[in-house]
C-alpha cells in the first residue's frame, strides 16, 4: 500500500542532493587548505541528521548545531561582505576581491547554496516530490532555518567596517524582510562592527540618480544607527566593471587594491 | 608595470579632426574602463569621454558630445579618441586614463598626456 | 550633476598638517579620489575610496568623507608635496567630476 506523503507548496529536494552536498564538501576542502581536516562523511551526516526523519515544519536552529560545529570557520571579520537580492554581483565581486567573503564563500554557505531540501517525519526518506514554502506552508521548514542559521552566526562574527550590497533596480532596495534585513542587521555586534556600508549597484547605464537618498535606505540607516553602528552609503554605477574582471580571472591587478 | 602612452597631438585648424591614439602594458586591456581627461593650459582637470573594456558602453561630456568618438581596439590594446568639429576651446593636453576596478570610478593610471592646439 | 569646490590655494609650513576641503551635495553618498599634479606632469592618484592610498604614496596622506565635504589631509607636510591638488567624484552616467584644484604651497 502506498503510503501518504504530505504535499507542500515548495519544490522538492534537490536531486542527488546527498552526492551534491559530499562533492561540494569535497571540492571545498581541496581548495581551501584551512579546512583539509573536515571530515566531509561526517559533515554529510550532521548535515543530514538536521532534517532527517523530522517534520520539515518543525526544525529548529538547534537541531543544525552538530552542522555548525564540523563546519567552524575563521573567515577575516573585517572583510565580511553581506548581500540581499544581489547574490550573482556579490559572487562575482569576491571571485576578483579574493579578500573578501559572501557567506556562500565559506564551507557551509558553499554546501548549501542554490539546493533545497526537507524530509519526513517518522521515517528515513529525503523528499523529492515537494517542501515546505516559507510562505504559504511554514517558515520553520529545514532550509529557512539552516540559512537563518548560517546567516546569524557569519553576521555575528563580523567586525571593523562590514559592507553589504544592495540591488538598486529593486523597488525595495532595502527589504527588512529579507534575510538580510530581518536576520543579518539584527546579528552585527555592535562592540565589534564600527560601520556598516552599504554599496547600492545601479542597473541602468545612465542612471545618475543618488539612490542613498531612497527612503528604505533611510530606513536601513535609522536601524543601523539604534544599534551605535556608524551608517554609510555609496552609489555604485557600473557593475558591468565586476564582469569585465570575472572574464579575466588571470590579471592580479584587477582588485581593489592599486 | 603599467604604461599608457598617447600620440596623435598637434596643431589644427578650427573645424578640423585629429585622431589622438593610446598605447597600453602591462596590464589586461580588456579588463578596464579606459578614459580621455584634459587640461586646458593654465587650467584644471576636465573628463572628456570613457569606455568599458567590452567596448559595448561609451560616455561623453556635454563638451564634446556629438563631435568627439571614443573607441578601443583590445587586440592591439589601444585606446583612440576621435575628434572632429574641433574648436578653440578644445585647446588642451589630453591624456589617457585607466579607470580603478570594481566598485571605484576614478583613475588609476595616466599617460604623460598629448598636446591639442586649436588655432588659426 | 553635482559641482565640486575646492579653495584655489592652501599655505602650510613645513611639518605641518595641511587639509584641502571638496564639498558638493550628498558627497558621502559617492567615493571621492585624490590627484596630485606638478609642474609639467601627470597627475597622479593618492587617495581613491575617500581614505584608501595606492601603494607607493605616503602614509602622510590621509583622505575622509562626510557630509557634504572630503577632506584631504597631508600631516607633516614636506617641501615636495608642493603641487596642485583635485578631488574627483563619479555621479552615474556621464557624470564624472573634478574639483577646480586647490594649489598647495609648502612655505619656506
Known amino acids: 500500500v502506498p503510503r501518504w506523503r504530505q504535499q507542500w507548496s515548495g519544490p522538492g529536494t534537490t536531486k542527488r542532493f546527498p552526492e551534491t552536498v559530499l562533492a561540494r564538501c569535497v571540492k571545498y576542502t581541496e581548495i581551501h587548505p584551512e579546512m583539509r581536516h573536515v571530515d566531509c562523511q561526517s559533515v554529510w551526516d550532521a548535515f543530514k541528521g538536521a532534517f532527517i526523519s523530522k517534520h520539515p515544519c518543525n526544525i529548529t536552529e538547534e537541531d543544525y548545531q552538530p552542522l555548525m560545529k564540523l563546519g567552524t570557520q575563521t573567515v577575516p571579520c573585517n572583510k565580511i561582505l553581506l548581500w540581499s537580492r544581489i547574490k550573482d554581483l556579490a559572487h562575482q565581486f569576491t571571485q576578483v576581491q579574493r579578500d573578501m567573503f559572501t557567506l556562500e564563500d565559506t564551507l557551509l554557505g558553499y554546501l548549501a547554496d542554490d539546493l533545497t531540501w526537507c524530509g519526513e517525519f517518522n521515517t528515513s526518506k529525503i523528499n523529492y516530490q515537494s517542501c515546505p514554502d516559507w510562505r504559504k506552508d511554514c517558515s520553520n521548514n529545514p532550509v529557512s532555518v539552516f540559512w537563518k542559521t548560517v546567516s546569524r552566526r557569519f553576521a555575528e562574527a563580523a567586525c571593523d567596517v562590514v559592507h553589504v550590497m544592495l540591488n538598486g533596480s529593486r523597488s525595495k532596495i532595502f527589504d527588512k524582510n529579507s534575510t538580510f534585513g530581518s536576520v543579518e542587521v539584527h546579528n552585527l555586534q555592535p562592540e565589534k562592527v564600527q560601520t556598516l556600508e552599504a554599496w547600492v549597484i545601479h542597473g541602468g547605464r545612465e542612471d545618475s540618480r543618488d539612490l542613498c537618498q531612497d527612503p528604505t535606505i533611510k530606513e536601513l540607516e535609522s536601524i543601523i544607527s539604534k544599534r551605535n553602528i556608524q551608517f554609510s552609503c555609496k552609489n555604485i554605477y557600473r557593475p558591468d566593471k565586476f564582469l569585465q574582471c570575472v572574464k579575466n580571472p588571470e590579471d592580479s591587478s584587477c582588485t581593489s587594491e592599486i | 608595470q603599467v604604461q599608457l602612452v598617447e600620440s596623435g597631438g598637434g596643431l589644427v585648424q578650427p573645424g578640423g579632426s585629429l585622431r589622438l591614439s593610446c598605447a597600453a602594458s602591462?596590464?589586461?586591456?580588456?579588463?578596464?574602463?579606459m578614459n580621455w581627461v584634459r587640461q586646458a593650459p593654465g587650467k584644471g582637470l576636465e573628463w572628456v569621454s570613457g569606455i568599458s573594456g567590452d567596448p559595448s558602453n561609451t560616455y561623453y561630456a556635454d563638451s564634446v558630445k556629438g563631435r568627439f568618438t571614443i573607441s578601443r581596439d583590445n587586440s592591439k590594446n589601444t585606446l583612440y579618441l576621435q575628434m572632429n568639429s574641433l574648436r578653440a576651446e578644445d585647446t588642451a593636453v589630453y591624456y589617457c586614463?585607466?579607470?580603478?576596478?570594481?566598485?571605484?570610478?576614478?583613475?588609476?593610471?595616466w599617460g604623460q598626456g598629448t598636446l591639442v592646439t586649436v588655432s588659426s | 550633476d553635482i559641482e565640486l569646490t575646492q579653495p584655489p590655494s592652501v599655505s602650510v609650513a613645513p611639518g605641518q598638517t595641511a587639509r584641502i576641503s571638496c564639498s558638493g551635495d550628498n558627497l558621502r553618498h559617492y567615493y571621492v579620489y585624490w590627484y596630485q599634479q606638478k609642474p609639467g606632469q601627470a597627475p597622479v592618484l593618492v587617495i581613491y575610496?575617500?581614505?584608501k592610498r595606492p601603494s607607493g604614496i605616503p602614509e602622510r596622506f590621509s583622505g575622509s568623507n562626510s557630509g557634504n565635504t572630503a577632506t584631504l589631509t597631508i600631516s607633516g607636510t614636506q617641501a615636495e608635496d608642493e603641487a596642485d591638488y583635485y578631488c574627483q567624484t563619479y555621479t552615474g552616467g556621464a557624470s564624472l567630476v573634478f574639483g577646480g584644484g586647490t594649489k598647495l604651497t609648502v612655505l619656506r
Open positions: 586614463a585607466r579607470d580603478l576596478p570594481l566598485v571605484y570610478t576614478g583613475f588609476a593610471y
Open positions: 575610496g575617500d581614505s
Open positions: 602591462g596590464f589586461t586591456f580588456s579588463s578596464y574602463y
